[in-house]
C-alpha cells in the first residue's frame, strides 16, 4: 500500500491501494531553505537543482565531525516529500535548494534572510512560473524574518514554514507567526497532534492547518537509494508545499489568498482530537489536516471564507484586539469572544483603507479575541453601517439600505460594563433578512456588500434553556460569512465561525443559573456567489483535460515496496 | 552585491560633520526600536540587522552604513559591514558591539535595529 | 586544519586577465570574509579587497575597483579574485586571508601560499 | 587612504638584543592595528592583533603596545627564528592599509 501520508493527503475518491497522488506540480518552482542536500539521490535526482547559496553559522563544539550524510540529512529527506519520484507529493515539480542550516541543523536569521533576498533577485532576473518557498525551520519571534516573508508574499511568492517543534504557541515562533506565510502544524496516522519526545508540534492562531508529520518515509542522505521515516513540522510543511505546487501547476494564476483558501477548504474537518492541545489554545487551533483538491475545477465557483483570529487582548480595561484579513480578502463579518464573558462586544472601522475587526475588553475582564471572516469576493463592495444604541427598548437596529448591497455580518458593541442587567431585546421579526438586531444600549453594525450575484440569507438556531454552546451551520453549496449571537447578554462568551458553522459560547450553565436569560440565539449569515458559479460553469465547458482529475486517472500507478526502509 | 560606495573620503568627511555639529539627525518624532529573541540562548549578540525606512535606496543604505562605521570610529569601535539588503528589506547587517546600539538608532532613515538569532530545523 | 590553499603561478601578458582560486578547508567556508591581498617584488603589503562568501557582499580599495573582481563557489569552498587590463606593475604574489572577528578586534588569521602572477610581453 | 608609516625599514640586531619597531598613523586609527611577520618566500603570519592582544601561539617576548596614531611592537629577547621582516596594518577604515616593512637582520 502507499505510505500512510500520501493516502491522508489523497482525496477520498482516489483512496484505493492501487492509486497515487497524480504526477503533477510540473509549471512551479519549489525553492527549499533548509540543509545542504545530497542530489544525486534515486529520489530527487534531476529534480533539484543546488544552488550556490550557502549561509550558515560554525557547528558547535570543537569535536564536532562533518559528516556528508548527517549533513544532508534534513534537506534530503524534504526535498524527497515535496517532490520525490516515489514517496513525494508533487512528483512534476522542480526544486532548488539553499543552504541556509549546517551540519546541526542550525542557521540564523540574517542568513535566512539573505537567503530569501536571494530568492527575490533570482526572480526579477529570470521571472519564471509560480513560486513556492519551503522553510522548514524556527527561530524565536523575529519581527525582521517576518516583515522579509511579507514582501516576499506580496511579490507573488507563497511561502510554507513549519509552525515548529515546541509544543508551544506557534505565534512565539518566525517565520511561523508570520500572516502572510502558511504556517503548518504536524498530525500523525491516527490525525492526532504529533509528541515529539517531551515537545511536539505548535499550535494556536498563527498555525493555518496541519498536515501528516510523524513517520514520514522518504529519501535518505545514508545512501542514493536508501528510505527513512522522519517526524516534524518540517515534513508536514513539505507536504503542503507539494499540494500547493500541484494546485498551482493546476491553476497558475492562484494568488496567495486564493490558494490559502482553498488548502483550507478542502482539507479534512475536525479530525482531529483538540484535547491533545492546552485548553485554551483549542478553539484558536484549526482543525484542519490538509489534503489535495479532488479537482481544480468546481472549486471556481465557491465563496472561499476563513476565520482569523486576533492575538488576545490583555487584560486592562480598554485594551482592545485587531483581527485583519489579507490584502486581497474581504472582512465580511466581525465577532469577540472572552473566557471570562466580560467583553464590550466587537466592531469593524477602517484602518488604512481597509477594514478591520477590533473586539473591546471590559473592566475584570480577562481579554478579548476579534475573530475576522475573511473571504474571496471579487469585484466586492462593502461598507458598514452603523446605528447608535437605542432610545426604545425594542433594541438598536441597522440594515443594509443601498440597493443591491446585502447583509453579510452582524457586530454589536456597548460602552456599559454589563449588558446582562438589562433587559433583553425582542428577537429579529422574521422576514427582515437584512438587517441586524441588537442589545438597545449596543451600537450595531452591519456589513453590507455589493458583489456580482452574491446572495445572502441568515439562519439561526435558538435554544431556550442555558447551554455552553448553540450552533448553526450553513447547507451544502452556502459559505458562512457572519456569525453572532442574539442577544448579547454578558453570559454569552461569544461567536465565532469554525469552518461553516458559527459557534455561540455560554457561560458555564451551572454559574448561570437558568432563567429567561438563558436562552441564546446562534445567528449565521450565509451566502454563495451565482457570478462565481456561472464563471466556473463557462471554464469547464471550454476546458478538457486540465484538471487534477485528469492527472490522477492517468496515474494509476502502483506503490513499490522494493526500496530499502532504513529506520 | 559588489560595493557601490567606494569613496572613502564620505567616512572622514562624516567624521568631520559631525565634529561640527553637522551631521544629519533622524526624522523628527520617529523613534527607531530595537528587538532581540525572547529566547536566551537563541540570541547571537554582536551581529545585528539594521532595518531602515521602507523606500529607503541602495545608495543611502550604504551610506548609512558608511556613516555608522565613521561614528563608531570615533568612539574607538570597529564595526564590519556584513551584507547591505535590497530587493526585499533596505538595511544592512552589521558586526558591532552592543554599546553602539543607542548611536545606531539614532542615525537616519533606521527604522528598526533587531539582534541576530539562530533558527533550527523542524 | 584550517588552511587557504592557492592556484598556481601564471605568467600574462600585458592587457589579458588573470584569475585565483583560493580553496577553504578545515572551517564553514560561509562564516568568515576572504581578503585579497598582493606584495610586489621586494614590496609591502597592499590591500586589494574582500568578499563575505555567504552573501556575496564586496568591499573593493579603490585603485582596483574598475579591474577587480571577487567571487566564490560555496559547493568547492573557494574564493576567487580576477584582475583584468593586466600592466607590467601588476606583476606580484597574489594573497588571500582568512578575516577572524572576535567582538571587537579582527585580523587575518590564516592566509594562502600566495600565487605569483608575472606580468610580461 | 590612511598611510601607515613604519621605522626604521631596516635594522640589524643579534640574538638576545630588545627591539622596537614604530608605526605612525596619519589619522586616528584607535587600537585597530595588527602586526604580521613574513619570512622571504612565506605568507605573513599574524602576531599582535588590536594593538597590544598577542595571538594564540606567538611567543611571550612579542609585545604591541599604542593607540591612536602611534603603534610600536617590542622583541624583548631576539631569537634566531625572528629574522624576519614584520608590517604593521591598520584596519579602522577602508581601505585596510599596511606599512613599508621593517627587516631585522642578523648583526
Known amino acids: 500500500s502507499i505510505p500512510w501520508n500520501l493516502e491522508r493527503i489523497t482525496p477520498p475518491r482516489y483512496r484505493a491501494d492501487e492509486y497515487q497522488p497524480p504526477d503533477g506540480g510540473s509549471l512551479v518552482e519549489v525553492y527549499l531553505l533548509d540543509t545542504s542536500i545530497q542530489s544525486d539521490h534515486r529520489e530527487i535526482e534531476g529534480r533539484v537543482m543546488v544552488t550556490d547559496f550557502e549561509n550558515v553559522p560554525e557547528e558547535d563544539g570543537t569535536r564536532f565531525h562533518r559528516q556528508a550524510s548527517k549533513c544532508d540529512s534534513h534537506g534530503t529527506h524534504l526535498a524527497g516529500v515535496v517532490s520525490g519520484r516515489d514517496a513525494g507529493v508533487a512528483k512534476g515539480a522542480s526544486m532548488r535548494s539553499l543552504r541556509v542550516l549546517n551540519c546541526q541543523g542550525k542557521g540564523t536569521v540574517s542568513g535566512t534572510l539573505i537567503g530569501l533576498e536571494f530568492i527575490r533577485k533570482s526572480q526579477l532576473v529570470q521571472p519564471v512560473g509560480p513560486l513556492v518557498v519551503l522553510l522548514p525551520l524556527a527561530g524565536g519571534y523575529s519581527r525582521v524574518l517576518n516583515a522579509a516573508c511579507q514582501r516576499l508574499a506580496r511579490a507573488g511568492v507563497v511561502l510554507v514554514t513549519a509552525a515548529g517543534n515546541f509544543r508551544d504557541d506557534a505565534c512565539l515562533y518566525s517565520p511561523a507567526s508570520a500572516p502572510e506565510v502558511i504556517t503548518v502544524g504536524a498530525t500523525n496516522a491516527q490525525d492526532q497532534p504529533v509528541t515529539l519526545g517531551t515537545l511536539g508540534t505548535n499550535f494556536g492562531r498563527c498555525v493555518d492547518l496541519f498536515a501528516p508529520g510523524e513517520d514520514i518515509i522518504g529519501a535518505s542522505s545514508d545512501c542514493s537509494t536508501c528510505f527513512v521515516s522522519q517526524s516534524g513540522t518540517s515534513q508536514a510543511a513539505a507536504h503542503v508545499a507539494g499540494i500547493a505546487a500541484m494546485m498551482l501547476s493546476a491553476e497558475p494564476e492562484l494568488t496567495l489568498a486564493e490558494l490559502r483558501q482553498r488548502l483550507i477548504h478542502f482539507s479534512a474537518k475536525d479530525v482531529i482530537n483538540e484535547a491533545w492541545f492546552p485548553e485554551d489554545q483549542r478553539v484558536l487551533t484549526p482543525n484542519l489536516v490538509a489534503a489535495l483538491p479532488p479537482s481544480t475545477h468546481g472549486a471556481g465557483w465557491q465563496l472561499f471564507c476563513r476565520t482569523v483570529w486576533s492575538a488576545h487582548s490583555g487584560p486592562t480595561r480598554m485594551a482592545t484586539a485587531v483581527a485583519r484579513c489579507a490584502p486581497d480578502e474581504e472582512l465580511l463579518s466581525c465577532s469577540s469572544f472572552s473566557r471570562s464573558g466580560k467583553r464590550r462586544g466587537e466592531r469593524m472601522e477602517a484602518q488604512g483603507g481597509k477594514l478591520v475587526c477590533r473586539a473591546h475588553n471590559a473592566f475584570g475582564g480577562e481579554g478579548v479575541y476579534a475573530i475576522a471572516r475573511c473571504c474571496l469576493l471579487p469585484q466586492a463592495n462593502c461598507s458598514v453601517h452603523t446605528a447608535p444604541p437605542a432610545e426604545a427598548s425594542m433594541g438598536t437596529r441597522v440594515h443594509c439600505h443601498q440597493q443591491g448591497h446585502v447583509l453579510t455580518g452582524c457586530s454589536s458593541h456597548w460602552e456599559v460594563e454589563d449588558l446582562g442587567t438589562h433587559k433583553p431585546p425582542v428577537l429579529r421579526p422574521r422576514g427582515q433578512p437584512n438587517q441586524c438586531v441588537g442589545h438597545r444600549e449596543a451600537s450595531i453594525h452591519a456589513s453590507c456588500c455589493h458583489a456580482p450575484g452574491l446572495e445572502c440569507k441568515v439562519k439561526e438556531h435558538g435554544i431556550p434553556a442555558p447551554q455552553e454552546q448553540v450552533t448553526v451551520a450553513c447547507e451544502e453549496g452556502w459559505t458562512l460569512t457572519g456569525c453572532s449571537a442574539l442577544p448579547g447578554t454578558s453570559h454569552v462568551l461569544g461567536a465565532y465561525a469554525v469552518d461553516n458553522t458559527c459557534v455561540v459560547r455560554s457561560r458555564d450553565v451551572s454559574t448561570t443559573g437558568s432563567t429567561s436569560e438563558g436562552a441564546v440565539t446562534a445567528v449565521a449569515i450565509c451566502c454563495r456567489s451565482r457570478h462565481l458559479a456561472q464563471a466556473s460553469q463557462e471554464l469547464q465547458g471550454s476546458t478538457s483535460g486540465s484538471g487534477l482529475n485528469d492527472i490522477f486517472e492517468a496515474q494509476k500507478i502502483e506503490w513499490h515496496e522494493h526500496h530499502h526502509h532504513h529506520h | 552585491q559588489e560595493d557601490e560606495d567606494g569613496d572613502y573620503e564620505e567616512l572622514v568627511l562624516a567624521l568631520r560633520s559631525e565634529e561640527d555639529g553637522l551631521a544629519e539627525a533622524p526624522e523628527h518624532g520617529t523613534t527607531a526600536t530595537f528587538h532581540r529573541c525572547a529566547k536566551d540562548p537563541w540570541r547571537l549578540p554582536g551581529t545585528y540587522v539594521v532595518v531602515l525606512k521602507e523606500e529607503t535606496h541602495l545608495s543611502q543604505s550604504e551610506r548609512t552604513a558608511r556613516r555608522l562605521q565613521a561614528q563608531a570610529a570615533r568612539r574607538g569601535y570597529l564595526t564590519k559591514i556584513l551584507h547591505v539588503f535590497h530587493g526585499l528589506l533596505p538595511g544592512f547587517l552589521v558586526k558591532m558591539s552592543g554599546d553602539l546600539l543607542e548611536l545606531a538608532l539614532k542615525l537616519p532613515h533606521v527604522d528598526y535595529i533587531e539582534e541576530d538569532s539562530s533558527v533550527f530545523a523542524q | 586544519q584550517v588552511q587557504l590553499v592557492q592556484s598556481g603561478a601564471e605568467v600574462k601578458k600585458p592587457g589579458a586577465s588573470v584569475k585565483v582560486s583560493c580553496k577553504a578547508s578545515?572551517?564553514?567556508?560561509?562564516?568568515?570574509?576572504i581578503h585579497w591581498v598582493r606584495q610586489a617584488p621586494g614590496q609591502g603589503l597592499e590591500w586589494m579587497g574582500e568578499i563575505n562568501p555567504s552573501s556575496t557582499y564586496t568591499k573593493f580599495n579603490q585603485k582596483f575597483k574598475d579591474r577587480v573582481t571577487m567571487t566564490r563557489d560555496t559547493s568547492i569552498s573557494t574564493a576567487y579574485m580576477e584582475l583584468s587590463r593586466l600592466r607590467s606593475d601588476d606583476t606580484a604574489v597574489y594573497y588571500c586571508a582568512r578575516e577572524r572577528i572576535y567582538s571587537n578586534y579582527w585580523f587575518f588569521d590564516v592566509w594562502g601560499q600566495g600565487t605569483t602572477v608575472t606580468v610580461s610581453s | 587612504d590612511i598611510v601607515m608609516t613604519q621605522s626604521p625599514s631596516s635594522l640589524s640586531a643579534s640574538v638576545g638584543d630588545r627591539v622596537t619597531i614604530t608605526c605612525k598613523a596619519s589619522q586616528n586609527v584607535y587600537t585597530a592595528v595588527a602586526w604580521y611577520q613574513q619570512k622571504p618566500g612565506k605568507s605573513p603570519k599574524l602576531l599582535i592583533y588590536s594593538a597590544s592582544n598577542r595571538y594564540t601561539g606567538v611567543p611571550s617576548r612579542f609585545s604591541g603596545s599604542g593607540s591612536g596614531t602611534d603603534f610600536t611592537l617590542t622583541i624583548s629577547s631576539l631569537q634566531p627564528e625572528d629574522f624576519a621582516t614584520y608590517f604593521c596594518q591598520q584596519y579602522s577604515s577602508y581601505p585596510y592599509t599596511f606599512g613599508g616593512g621593517t627587516k631585522v637582520e642578523i648583526k
Open positions: 578545515g572551517y564553514t567556508f560561509t562564516g568568515y570574509t
